[in-house]
């Protein structure tokens, strides 16, 4: 009896795992084995597919074959007993196009009101994604174990922190990878669940801000309790995309280790040009807080976002304010190569009632002033970039007296 060729061959590729599945053509014939050959583009000869020779089941793995994943290949299969069936050819395919992204590995760290999620590709040093390893983005679905109401978070990187959670609550999540450049969406990881901890008696520091004074950065934050010590750590922001990188390590700012005030001062030359993340932790000697929310810190913007310098021309019922480039040490003006908005605050010297003007122009009129009255003015600059929402500190206040009446010209 002639053996029939196997049919319905499916090629499944997940990361670097190449699996073939097929249907037996004749279930009634026992002790049949199956063998595959493959052929690369531009070649005439067929080569035995290692791992898929004399297979008794209807599945085989040819992951050990070192293929160029961007090169088209063709497969053929036949059944064998005493004789052999004719070959059945499978449509040619390119492994990279066919491949799916496997489930990522997930490691969770619990805080009282946050979860830190560390995500890495499921296959280490994958050949399939060798050129795309740094292009992975991830999305996740998270839910409270008790409610099951799902929240989706898209476009996250290899390390992500979810805030504003409830203490002592079990949260579950699953993560999948995507390669947006290749329009590939991966397979979800298994579900991981973790319980947030009891509420920490010491809350994390809040409202972290960086400003510049002379040649130093001044880092300030708010804290609920007195008599605490604090430490500050930094990380290159780009490393959030790639925690596999051996440089991915939060590092101490030496001048901000075990500080006893809610600020620390460190030289600008601690950081080269770049974008960094900063975080602060509090300790009372016995207990330690969890880390604060991370703030983004861009040396380019921070270093040059100095308070504006301005001149005032006083009239009887208004001030004309002329804003100039701020001066660095050495009295050289700073070149601002990004758009700024100016916030001008003014008040009567004898009053606490402040008024505010927001203006894009560098010449500003402060109207509706009283003659022969001392007014004080201070100003600060803001970047107009939403992603890097930075503000300079306020300039020192300048106080001037308005002129007598009828000098508005």
């Amino acid at each position: 009896k002639n053996l029939k060729s196997p049919q319905k061959v499916e090629v499944d590729i997940i990361d670097d795992n190449f699996i073939l599945r097929w249907n037996r053509s004749d279930e009634s014939v026992g002790n049949v084995t199956f063998s595959f050959d493959y052929q690369k583009t531009g070649m005439d000869n067929w080569i035995k597919l290692s791992g898929c020779q004399n297979i008794t089941s209807t599945k085989c793995n040819f992951s050990s074959l070192k293929l160029n994943v961007y090169e088209e290949i063709k497969l053929r299969i036949r059944a064998e007993k005493e004789n052999t069936s004719s070959w059945y050819e499978v449509d040619s395919f390119t492994p990279f196009r066919k491949a799916q992204i496997g489930p990522p590995e997930v490691h969770l760290e619990a805080e009282d009101k946050a979860i830190v999620i560390h995500i890495s590709p499921g296959t280490k040093d994958s050949v399939m994604w060798a050129l795309d390893g740094l292009s992975f983005t991830y999305s996740l679905v998270i839910w409270k174990n008790s409610s099951g109401v799902e929240e989706r978070i898209e476009n996250i990187y290899s390390r992500h922190k979810i805030y504003k959670l409830s203490p002592e609550t079990t949260y579950c999540l699953k993560v999948k990878a995507a390669l947006l450049t290749s329009w590939k969406i991966g397979v979800y990881s298994p579900v991981h669940c973790i319980k947030t901890t009891v509420e920490n008696e010491l809350p994390p520091p809040e409202n972290i801000e960086v400003s510049v004074q002379n040649q130093n950065y001044v880092l300030k934050w708010d804290y609920t309790y007195a008599n605490m010590t604090f430490q500050v750590q930094w990380l290159h922001a780009f490393l959030k995309r790639n925690p596999g990188n051996h440089l991915y390590k939060w590092k101490q700012i030496p001048d901000c280790e075990n500080v006893k005030t809610t600020q620390c001062v460190f030289p600008q030359n601690v950081f080269q040009k770049g974008i960094y993340l900063l975080r602060v932790q509090a300790s009372d000697g016995n207990n330690t807080s969890f880390w604060s929310e991370e703030i983004k810190f861009d040396t380019e913007i921070q270093a040059f976002l100095l308070p504006p310098v301005f001149n005032i021309r006083s009239l009887s019922d208004s001030f004309h304010i002329y804003i100039g480039a701020p001066k660095q040490s050495g009295n050289t003006p700073v070149i601002q190569d990004y758009p700024l908005i100016y916030e001008i605050i003014f008040w009567e010297n004898t009053s606490n009632a402040e008024r505010k003007i927001i203006e894009k122009k560098t010449d500003v009129t402060v109207p509706n002033l009283k003659p022969l009255t001392v007014y004080c003015v201070k100003a600060r600059a803001h970047t107009m970039d939403e992603k890097l929402n930075k503000s300079s500190v306020f300039s020192d206040a300048v106080c001037e007296k308005t002129k007598p009446g009828n000098t508005s010209k």
Partner: antibody, heavy 123, light 107 residues
Framework: QVQLVQSGAEVKKPGASVKVSCKAS????????MNWVRQAPGQGLEWMGK????????HFNQKFRDRVTMTRDTSTSTVYMELSSLRSEDTAVYYC????????????????WGQGTLVTVSS | DIQMTQSPSSLSASVGDRVTITCKSS??????LAWYQQKPGKAPKLLIS???TLESGVPSRFSGSGSGKDYTLTISSLQPEDFATYYC?????????FGQGTKLEIK
């Protein structure tokens, strides 16, 4: 698979130093903290300190700070723990143990351990 | 330093018994607690991390629970290979500290 292989047993005189090695394989050596834990005969476990093999940053138990040195050789994926000014109470089995990933926000448990090195301090 | 107090220090039980070992920390350790099993002449083996997470390859009869300062290791049905010494360890604050151990013996 992850393996930590330690150097052989040592007998030392009081006042001498001992240097124990721990060779790691089966994972990315520079991505995980390496810890040292000791256990005196019939006693419990005592954490001595840890080293980051990527940049040699160390954290020590204050009890050992003045006497312990931890180093690493990335070319051979080996960490070393040297204990100086030995005394009889330093007689113990010394273990290296892998800690958490260096990229983690917080410390982690010790998931793989070496087989231990017995150091005997006797005059 | 954070003190870890394990109880009992020794325990006799029979195969099939349910056994509970407790560990108390002097400060809140926010679930940064591990349980290890050690057999004579061998290195400790990690059973549970994060107070409740069973390490891969560890039989499901082992489980961990607790939060704050109070943690528990439970073996639901003792097997002959479970007779050993068990240690808890906190890794919230340095120096990491271990409990004094619980020796589990055959009754």
């Amino acid at each position: 698979q992850v393996q930590l292989v330690q150097s052989g047993a040592e007998v030392k005189k009081p006042g001498a130093s001992v240097k124990v090695s721990c060779k790691a394989s089966g994972y990315t050596f520079t991505s995980y903290w390496m810890n040292w834990v000791r256990q005196a005969p019939g006693q419990g476990l005592e954490w001595m300190g840890k080293i980051d093999p990527s940049d040699s940053e160390t954290h020590f138990n204050q009890k050992f700070r003045d006497r312990v040195t931890m180093t690493r050789d990335t070319s051979t994926s080996t960490v070393y723990m040297e204990l100086s000014s030995l005394r009889s109470e330093d007689t113990a089995v010394y273990y290296c143990a892998r800690g958490g990933r260096i990229s983690f926000d917080y410390d982690a448990a010790l998931d793989y351990w070496g087989q231990g090195t017995l150091v005997t301090v006797s005059s | 330093d954070i003190q870890m107090t394990q109880s009992p220090s020794s325990l006799s039980a029979s195969v099939g018994d349910r056994v509970t070992i407790t560990c108390k920390s002097s400060e809140v350790i926010y679930n940064r607690l591990a349980w290890y099993q050690q057999k004579p002449g061998k290195a400790p083996k990690l059973l549970i991390s994060g107070a409740t997470t069973l390490e891969s390859g560890v039989p499901s009869r082992f489980s961990g629970s607790g939060s704050g300062k109070d943690y528990t290791l439970t073996i639901s049905s003792l097997q002959p290979e479970d007779f050993a010494t068990y240690y808890c360890q906190q890794y919230w604050n340095k120096p990491f500290t271990f409990g004094q151990g619980t020796k589990l013996e055959i009754k």
